[in-house]
Amino acid sequence: QAGPLPKPTLWAEPGSVISWGNSVTIWCQGTLEAREYRLDKEESPAPWDRQNPLEPKNKARFSIPSMTEDYAGRYRCYYRSPVGWSQPSDPLELVMTGAYSKPTLSALPSPLVTSGKSVTLLCQSRSPMDTFLLIKERAAHPLLHLRSEHGAQQHQAEFPMSPVTSVHGGTYRCFSSHGFSHYLLSHPSDPLELIVSGSLEDPRPSPTRSVSTAAGPEDQPLMPTGSVPHSGLRRHWE
């Protein structure tokens, strides 16, 4: 029974996005009155793990020595004090990268773009995926992703940017993922440096609607043709 106790804080070190095989530590911090900590993983039998508190009893450590697919997912923690169990923490989403081979990221027509013009970043995966994520290094809100609306799997997704400003310049990578677990991502693509030249400035760039395409009939090397509907992918800003 959840009581009136304040909810604990849940976090992961070195972070919540972990490469396959790397270690990660999940921390749950409650109060000095805590007697026991419990970690629950969504869609797993509860509790996923229990730990005694570390001195001075206000937090517990849950160790994952080697990240695998089984550990990826959504976690919450609780603590028990003499008066009962706390409220659940806010969720922690533990994401594993390296689940699939890296996609390839291209800039069309070129990674050298004049301010005010358009550019499209194209992320292509080896196997069909239904989610593509575009990451910009050192951005305040770096994550942009496209998800298939009907679970239709695609080999590629386009991220158009128009009009381009200096704000768009920087280093990008993309990831791909399957719908059955958005906590499992591919290796990151090789970095793509987008270089914006010129002086047309727009302080609030707005990427246009994203498009996902099925393979073309001739010029989509080693991609199946006609196997995927042209239903678009839904864009999400995060």
Partner: antibody
Framework: EVQLVQSGAEVKKPGASVKVSCKAS????????IDWVKQPPGKGLEWIGY????????SYNQKFKGRATMTVDKSTSTVYMELSSLRSEDTAVYYC??????????WGQGTTVTVSS | DIVMTQSPDSLAVSLGERATINCKSS????????????LAWYQQKPGQAPRLLIY???TRESGVPDRFAGSGSGTDFTLTISSLQAEDVAVYYC?????????FGQGTKLEIK
């Protein structure tokens, strides 16, 4: 560290079959295609086909279709290639290789198959 | 099938000198969808498995020394070793991954002069 470790050398008679294994470690096994490549003694490389461990999907070079069969055991992170109706020209080193984006970023050490009467 | 033809078949170069290996494909490996060339280069030392050097015609694989460089587009490609080292003695293969079946060049044997 990504590793592909193949089974040992085989000597077979013409008409027999051989099954070569490739055990993967050091990466997320299910999400990467594994291909097989043939290299006859002193010759070049020839692609045989691939298997996708996640769902068992296979594709074969037409030249090997009907004679090569690729299978996967996810519980042991191992892929297998069986080559049937062996003939002398099948004498070669057979490599498994992990596909990145249709190119191969990691290779097994190779398995020598000798077909001789 | 796409036919890959390498030249020369063998090459002898002095230590510290430049080595150049060519690879020609029977059709273009340049995709108009992403402006990339679907070509890789491998190095195979005696008794060893091949090792990936270059992909997308010019992207060096992690850990590969920067004396190795790939160039070219369409149907004509080059692998250049800017300053040959003793450990570079090997057979070098190009591979197209534009279409199935995947195909390799016949190989170029690189030796020390």
């Amino acid at each position: 560290e990504v590793q592909l470790v193949q089974s040992g050398a085989e000597v077979k008679k013409p008409g027999a079959s051989v099954k070569v294994s490739c055990k993967a470690s050091g990466y997320s096994f299910s999400g990467f295609y594994i291909d097989w490549v043939k290299q006859p003694p002193g010759k070049g490389l020839e692609w045989i086909g691939y298997i996708f461990p996640s769902n068992g999907e296979t594709s074969y070079n037409q030249k090997f279709k009907g004679r090569a069969t690729m299978t996967v055991d996810k519980s042991t992170s191992t892929v297998y290639m069986e080559l049937s109706s062996l003939r002398s020209e099948d004498t070669a080193v057979y490599y498994c290789a992990r596909q990145a984006f249709y190119y191969f970023d990691y290779w097994g050490q190779g398995t020598t198959v000798t077909v001789s009467s | 099938d796409i036919v890959m033809t390498q030249s020369p078949d063998s090459l002898a170069v002095s230590l510290g000198e430049r080595a150049t290996i060519n690879c020609k494909s029977s059709q273009s490996l340049l995709s108009s969808s992403n402006q990339k060339n679907y070509l890789a280069w491998y190095q195979q030392k005696p008794g060893q498995a091949p090792r990936l050097l270059i992909y997308w015609a010019s992207t060096r694989e992690s850990g590969v020394p920067d004396r190795f460089a790939g160039s070219g587009s369409g149907t004509d490609f080059t692998l250049t070793i800017s300053s040959l080292q003793a450990e570079d003695v090997a057979v070098y293969y190009c591979q197209q991954y534009y279409s199935y079946p995947l195909t390799f060049g016949q190989g170029t044997k690189l030796e020390i002069k």
